[in-house]
Interface confidence: medium
C-alpha cells in the first residue's frame, strides 16, 4: 500500500522534523527516581525542535515513529562502586498519559559506570517520556556523559 | 538524480542527506591520542557522502543537526585487562576550528572491552570531529568492532 | 519558516521510509546461534514498515544505507554469571544471500549483562540480517531489554 497517491505530496516541512537533545538538570527528591532534563541553545548544545519539556520531562508533539536514545554515566563511580551499589537501573518509558504507560528501554549498570542505548518506538502527541534511575548512585551532569534525545523518523 | 520527475519536488541533494561511516585506519603516534579513520567502498562497507576526511579526521560539509555514533572495541582485551589498564576513555569532540572545540561524547571502558554510544548534536560546515582514545590499550581494527559515523538529521 | 516553498514537494512514499523494530520471539535449537525475531502491532510496540520477516530473520526490501541498532540483555544474569560464561558474543550480519555474507556489528558481554550498539551500513533488497548469540546464556525476552531494528536513511 502506498503512503500517498503520487499527486498527493507533502511539503518538506510537514514531514515532521521533530527532534530534541537534552542535558541533565537535576535528580528528583529522594522518593522520585526520575531524572529532570533541560534543553535550549543558551545551555550549550541541547535543543528542542517540536517536543517540549514539562517539569523536566519530555513531551511529544507529533505522532510518529521516533528514535529514542540515551546515555547516562554514573558520577563518583568505578566498576567496584557500580557492583557494590547494584542494582542500579535506568528505564525510559511513557509515564503519561497513564493509559499509555509502558517501559520502552531498560538497562542495568552491573560493573559499568555508563549505559547507552537507542530504539525505535511509536509515540503519540501528548506522550510524556520519563527516565527513571533507580539505586543510590548519582548521574554525572557533564553534558558529554549524560544526555537524552528523540528524533522523529516517520509517520 | 531526483527521487521523482515532477517539477513540484525537491532534489535529493537539497535534503542534505550527508552521511558517513568510517573504519579505523590507525592510531596516532605516542603523544597523539586521536584515532585515524578511513572510508570508501573500496575498503568494504565504509563510505562518505558529503563529509570528508582530513588527515584521518572527519570534516563536516553541511550545517545541521547530526546523529553521531561510535563503537570502539579494545584489542587483546578481557575484563581483567580493561580494569587493570583503567582509565581507558574514548571522547568524541569538535577539535577544529579551535573556537568551537568541545567534547561531545565521552565514555570509559571500566571492566568492559567495548563502548558504543550515539547522540544528536548541531554541527557546522568546517567542523572537524576527533576521537581521542586515552590509555595504553589499543583498539581493534576489525570493521564490525570499531566504527564511527555521522548522519545529517535536519537543518 | 518552511524548509521549502509549498510547491516543492516529495511524495512521501518516494522517501523510502522503510523501518522495522522487532522483539525477541525465541532462540534457535542447540546448534543454531541465531535469535528469532517477531514484530507487529498485535505484539506491542514492534512493527515492520517495508522490511519483512523470513523465518524470524529480517529481510530488506529497499536498497539504501540503513541505521541498524540492537540491544540484547541476558536473562538471569549478574556480572559474575557473565564473566563465568565468557565469551558470550552477539554478532549482527548479512547471512543471505551467501555471496553477501558479512559480519556488520559484533560485541562481547564480558562482565556486563547488556550490549547495545548501532551502525550505518549499506543494505540491498533481499539481504537477510541474522543476529547470532554465541555462548550458553539465554537472552531476556522482555521487550524493553531486547530489541533489534533498522531504519532506512538514504539511497
Amino acid at each position: 500500500q502506498r503512503f500517498a497517491q503520487a499527486q498527493q505530496q507533502l511539503p518538506l516541512e510537514s514531514l515532521g522534523w521533530d527532534v530534541a537533545e537534552l542535558q541533565l538538570n537535576h535528580t528528583g527528591p529522594q522518593q522520585d527516581p526520575r531524572l529532570y532534563w533541560q534543553g535550549g541553545p543558551a545551555l550549550g548544545r541541547s535543543f528542542l525542535h517540536g517536543p517540549e519539556l514539562d517539569k523536566g520531562q519530555l513531551r511529544i508533539h507529533r505522532d510518529g515513529i521516533y528514535m529514542v536514545h540515551i546515555q547516562v554515566t554514573l558520577a563518583i563511580c568505578s566498576s567496584t562502586t557500580a557492583s557494590r551499589h547494584h542494582p542500579t537501573t535506568l528505564a525510559v518509558g511513557i509515564c503519561s498519559p497513564a493509559s499509555r504507560s509502558i517501559s520502552l528501554l531498560r538497562l542495568s549498570f552491573h560493573q559499568g559506570c555508563t549505559i547507552a542505548s537507542q530504539r525505535l518506538t511509536p509515540l503519540a502527541r501528548g506522550d510524556t517520556l520519563c527516565t527513571n534511575l533507580t539505586g543510590t548512585l548519582l548521574p554525572s551532569r557533564n553534558t558529554d556523559e549524560t544526555f537524552f534525545g528523540v528524533q522523529w523518523v516517520r509517520p | 538524480q531526483r527521487f521523482a520527475q515532477a517539477q513540484q519536488q525537491l532534489p535529493l541533494e537539497s535534503l542534505g542527506w550527508d552521511v558517513a561511516e568510517l573504519q579505523l585506519n590507525h592510531t596516532g603516534p605516542q603523544q597523539d591520542p586521536r584515532l585515524y579513520w578511513q572510508g570508501g567502498p573500496a575498503l568494504g562497507r565504509s563510505f562518505l557522502h558529503g563529509p570528508e576526511l582530513d588527515k584521518g579526521q572527519l570534516r563536516i560539509h553541511r550545517d545541521g543537526i547530526y546523529m553521531v555514533h561510535i563503537q570502539v572495541t579494545l584489542a587483546i582485551c578481557s575484563s581483567t585487562t580493561a580494569s587493570r589498564h583503567h582509565p581507558t576513555t574514548l571522547a568524541v569532540g569538535i577539535c577544529s576550528p579551535a573556537s568551537r572545540s568541545i567534547s561531545l561524547l565521552r565514555l570509559s571502558f571500566h571492566q568492559g572491552c567495548t563502548i558504543a554510544s550515539q547522540r544528536l548534536t548541531p554541527l557546522a560546515r568546517g567542523d572537524t570531529l576527533c576521537t581521542n582514545l586515552t590509555g595504553t590499550l589499543l583498539p581493534s581494527r576489525n570493521t564490525d568492532e570499531t566504527f564511527f559515523g555521522v548522519q545529517w538529521v535536519r537543518p | 519558516q518552511r524548509f521549502a516553498q509549498a510547491q516543492q514537494q516529495l511524495p512521501l512514499e518516494s522517501l523510502g521510509w522503510d523501518v522495522a523494530e522487532l522483539q525477541l520471539n525465541h532462540t534457535g535449537p542447540q546448534q543454531d546461534p541465531r535469535l528469532y525475531w517477531q514484530g507487529g502491532p498485535a505484539l506491542g510496540r514492534s512493527f515492520l514498515h517495508g522490511p519483512e520477516l523470513d523465518k524470524g530473520q529480517l529481510r530488506i526490501h529497499r536498497d539504501g544505507i540503513y541505521m541498524v541498532h540492537i540491544q540484547v540483555t541476558l536473562a538471569i544474569c549478574s556480572s559474575t554469571t557473565a564473566s563465568r560464561h565468557h565469551p558470550t558474543t552477539l554478532a549482527v550480519g548479512i547471512c543471505s544471500p551467501a555471496s553477501r555474507s558479512i559480519s556488520l556489528l559484533r560485541l562481547s558481554f564480558h562482565q556486563g549483562c547488556t550490549i547495545a550498539s548501532q551502525r550505518l551500513t549499506p543494505l540491498a533488497r533481499g539481504d537477510t540480517l541474522c543476529t547470532n548469540l554465541t555462548g550458553t546464556l539465554l537472552p531476556s525476552r522482555n521487550t524493553d531489554e531486547t530489541f533489534f531494528g533498522v531504519q532506512w536513511v538514504r539511497p
Partner: antibody, heavy 122, light 110 residues
Framework: EVQLVESGGGLVQPGGSLRLSCAAS????????MNWVRQAPGKGLEWVSD????????YYADSVKGRFTISRDNSKNSLYLQMNSLRAEDTAVYYC???????????????WGQGTLVTVSS | QAVVTQEPSLTVSPGGTVTLTCGLK?????????PTWYQQTPGQAPRLLIY???TRHSGVPDRFSGSILGNKAALTITGAQADDEAEYFC??????????FGGGTQLTVL
C-alpha cells in the same frame, strides 16, 4: 599536569567592579564544570559559583547572586568572574577550581589555582 | 553561623591516629551528604583528599580514610606525619547545587 592560574585581583572600593580570570592548561578544559571558591582572611572556604562545561548553565551562592557573573571561553581555556557592586565582605582570596565531574549536583574540586586576593576597602 | 561544624583544632603525635569530624548544626550527616575532605597548608591552595564519604582521591596516601561515625562524617589519619600538619576542611552537599564548607580544623602534629 593540570594548572589553574588566577589573575585580576586587587584593591577596589565598595560598590566597584573587578573581573577575575583563570587560565587553564594541562587538561581538556571544555569537558569540565568550573567553579570559583573564596576564602576570607583567616576564615573557611565558601563556594561562590559554577558554570557547566559548555557555558550555558550557571549557579551562584545566595551571597553573590545578582552581583557576580561567571563565564568561560573554551577556545581560550579561560574562566572569568565579573564582580560588580563589591562589598567589604567580598574581601577574600578567590580560587578557580575544577569540578571533578563526579556528580550531578555535588561539586567536588579536584584541582585548584593558587588564588588571587580581592580587597574591598575605602 | 556555620551550618557545617568541625573541631577548631586537634593535636596528634607523630605516628599516632587522629579522627576529625564533620557534623550538621541540625541533623545527622549521611552518605547522601557526600562528605568531601580537603587539606590546606599555609599559603597553599586546598587539596582534595576524600570524596563520596570514603573514596580517596588519586595520589592520596592510604593513611587517610573517610567514614560515617555515628551522626558525623569522619576523616581518620593513621600514622600521622609531620607534613600532615595543615587545616582540614569538610564539605557537605546540603541543597542543590551548592556545597557548604565547615569552618576547618587546624591539625597540629606535635
Amino acid at each position: 599536569e593540570v594548572q589553574l592560574v588566577e589573575s585580576g585581583g586587587g584593591l577596589v572600593q565598595p560598590g566597584g567592579s573587578l573581573r577575575l580570570s583563570c587560565a587553564a592548561s594541562g587538561f581538556t578544559f571544555s569537558v569540565y564544570y568550573m567553579n570559583w571558591v573564596r576564602q576570607a582572611p583567616g576564615k573557611g572556604l565558601e563556594w561562590v559559583s559554577d558554570i557547566n562545561n559548555e557555558g550555558g548553565t550557571t549557579y551562584y551562592a545566595d551571597s553573590v547572586k545578582g552581583r557576580f557573573t561567571i563565564s568561560r571561553d573554551n577556545s581560550k581555556n579561560s574562566l572569568y568572574l565579573q564582580m560588580n557592586s563589591l562589598r567589604a565582605e567580598d574581601t577574600a582570596v578567590y580560587y578557580c577550581a575544577r569540578d571533578a565531574g563526579y556528580s550531578n549536583h555535588v561539586p567536588i574540586f579536584d584541582s585548584w589555582g593558587q588564588g588571587t586576593l580581592v580587597t574591598v576597602s575605602s | 553561623q556555620a551550618v557545617v561544624t568541625q573541631e577548631p583544632s586537634l593535636t596528634v603525635s607523630p605516628g599516632g591516629t587522629v579522627t576529625l569530624t564533620c557534623g550538621l548544626k541540625s541533623g545527622s550527616v549521611t552518605s547522601d551528604n557526600f562528605p568531601t575532605w580537603y587539606q590546606q597548608t599555609p599559603g597553599q591552595a586546598p587539596r582534595l583528599l576524600i570524596y563520596n564519604t570514603n573514596t580517596r582521591h588519586s595520589g592520596v596516601p592510604d593513611r587517610f580514610s573517610g567514614s560515617i561515625l555515628g551522626n558525623k562524617a569522619a576523616l581518620t589519619i593513621t600514622g600521622a606525619q609531620a607534613d600532615d600538619e595543615a587545616e582540614y576542611f569538610c564539605a557537605l552537599f546540603i541543597s542543590n547545587p551548592s556545597v557548604e564548607f565547615g569552618g576547618g580544623t587546624q591539625l597540629t602534629v606535635l
